[in-house]
């Protein structure tokens, strides 16, 4: 796997353990938690970046309404369990035999249940919509330009392909950017955007987890953009399952 | 295989506007490539003017931004660059190229078309 | 910009020569690296991207190393073909993407 050859650190994950194991006397990262091998050259999956979390020592431009099915990530942290790829198995469970099921970026997607819920299959997340609020700045910002600048972010960033940003909503203070990722979409290699999203969200909470990288420092026309606020919706390709009770709470 | 050809007047005259074509073959124009020019002055080296994929915005080198449009024909299966208000430092041998990656390194290129600026 | 800067501009060597040319970014560019072989009338030619990733089809006497600021192409045993000039460029940064100055090999 590529990581940096001279000191042996995975730019992309902090979260890792490299040393010059690899074949040939390369370096091999792998991530806290899991111990799974990681590629330095791309986002590491969310599944295993919440799993080294978990490990590490505590410390018209209308906007977008989100779909009744729409998902937030209300449970937070928990230690996930991944598959051999990374990604998270179907059925979580914790350490009280309490199991539920999720969706492809880890979020809860019906009633907890015990160990004899069946979780059938991982519930692809295919379009996830992104709510900030910056703070007051002087003016708005131009929508275009602004528009611009979150592309070449998640372009250069996250090497999510544009295609996969299918709009940026702006209007004073909160923006929207819409991430859409289809299964028959995605090809191999490609940057999966329940990841991207994950990296933004960590990145614009100033925890970024790029090595040795600085912080997000997010600009447009030089006016800096500080986001005060963050909320994420998860949209399935099947829709969620939860109990009327849930709907109506 | 993959082609690109470059076609286009080889000789545009100072404040006036170069216009080039490529012709791509073997690959679909909207494939999940970038479509690029890059041109090398006489002598020199390399450098990239800018870049579009179908269904996206085209992006361009800061340098030229303000006279370069680059455009995509889907039904032609073709790509093209104008670049306006010319000099003599436009001169150049023109390539088109297919970009691959989420930013573009360039597996294929055309043979290039020597574009001279002159009255 | 990143700015490529690649060194040497020139250098001369023979047939069964080991040759190693560098390029330098100024700022991280993490691996996002490619290596390209042009020569005179003709187009450039792709050799090695994402660093150490060599092109299919080309011979693997051309390797690729570094990241970050620091990159090298190595060519482990030069043969008649190899005398041309050599180009870095990085794509980490689309805004815009960036060449090196070229090194020219010949024929000592």
């Known amino acids: 796997h590529t990581a940096a050859q001279d000191n042996c650190t995975c730019p992309t994950n902090k979260m890792t353990v490299c040393s010059p194991d690899g074949p040939g006397g390369r370096c091999q990262c792998r991530a806290l938690g899991s111990g799974m091998a990681v590629d330095c050259s791309t986002l590491t999956s969310k599944c295993l970046l919440l799993k080294a979390r978990m490990s590490a020592p505590k410390n018209a431009r209308t906007l977008v309404r989100p779909s009744e099915h729409a998902l937030v990530d209300n449970d937070g942290l928990y230690d996930p369990d991944c598959d051999p790829e990374g990604r998270f198995k179907a059925r979580q469970c914790n350490q009280t035999s309490v199991c539920w099921c999720v969706n492809s970026v880890g979020v809860r997607r019906t009633d907890k249940g015990d160990l004899s819920l069946r979780c059938d299959e991982l519930v692809r997340t295919h379009h996830i919509l992104i709510d900030l609020r910056h703070r007051p700045t002087a003016g708005a910002f131009n929508h275009s330009d602004l528009d611009a600048e979150l592309r070449r972010l998640f372009r250069e960033r996250y090497r999510l392909h544009p295609k996969f940003v299918a709009a940026v909503h702006y209007e004073q203070p909160t923006i929207q950017i819409e991430l859409r990722q289809n299964t028959s979409q995605k090809a191999a290699g490609d940057v999966d955007i329940g990841d991207a999203a994950y990296y933004f969200e960590r990145d614009i909470k100033g925890e970024s987890l790029f090595q040795g990288r600085g912080g997000l420092d997010l600009r447009v026309r030089g006016e800096p953009l500080q986001v005060e606020r963050t909320l994420i919706y998860y949209l399935d390709e099947i829709p969620p399952k939860f109990s009327m009770k849930r709907l109506t709470a | 295989q993959v082609q690109l050809q470059e076609s286009g007047p080889g000789l545009v005259k100072p404040s006036g506007t170069l216009s080039l074509t490529c012709a791509v073959s073997g690959d679909s124009i909207s494939s999940n490539n970038w479509w690029s020019w890059v041109r090398q002055p006489p002598g020199k080296g390399l450098e990239w003017i800018g870049e579009?994929?179908?269904?996206?915005?085209?992006n361009y080198n800061p340098s030229l931004k303000s006279r370069v449009t680059i455009s995509v024909d889907k039904s032609k299966n073709q790509f093209s660059l104008k670049l306006n208000s010319v000099t003599a430092a436009d001169t150049a041998v023109y390539y088109c190229?297919?970009?691959?990656?989420?930013?573009?390194?360039?597996?294929?290129w055309g043979q290039g078309t020597l574009v001279t600026v002159s009255s | 910009d990143i700015q490529m800067t690649q060194s040497p501009s020139t250098l001369s060597a023979s047939v069964g020569d080991r040759v190693t040319i560098t390029c330098r970014a100024s700022?991280?560019?993490?691996?996002?690296l490619a290596w390209y072989q042009q020569k005179p009338g003709k187009a450039p030619k792709l050799l090695i991207y994402k660093a150490s990733s060599l092109e299919s089809g080309v011979p693997s006497r051309f390797r690729g190393s570094g990241s970050g600021t620091e990159f090298t192409l190595t060519i482990s045993s030069l043969q008649p073909d190899d005398f041309a000039t050599y180009y870095c460029q990085q794509y980490s940064s689309y805004s815009p993407i960036t060449f090196g100055q070229g090194s020219r090999l010949e024929i000592k």
């Open positions: 700022q991280s560019i993490g691996h996002w």
């Open positions: 190229a297919r970009g691959s990656g989420v930013i573009s390194y360039f597996d294929y």
């Open positions: 579009i994929y179908p269904g996206g915005n085209p």
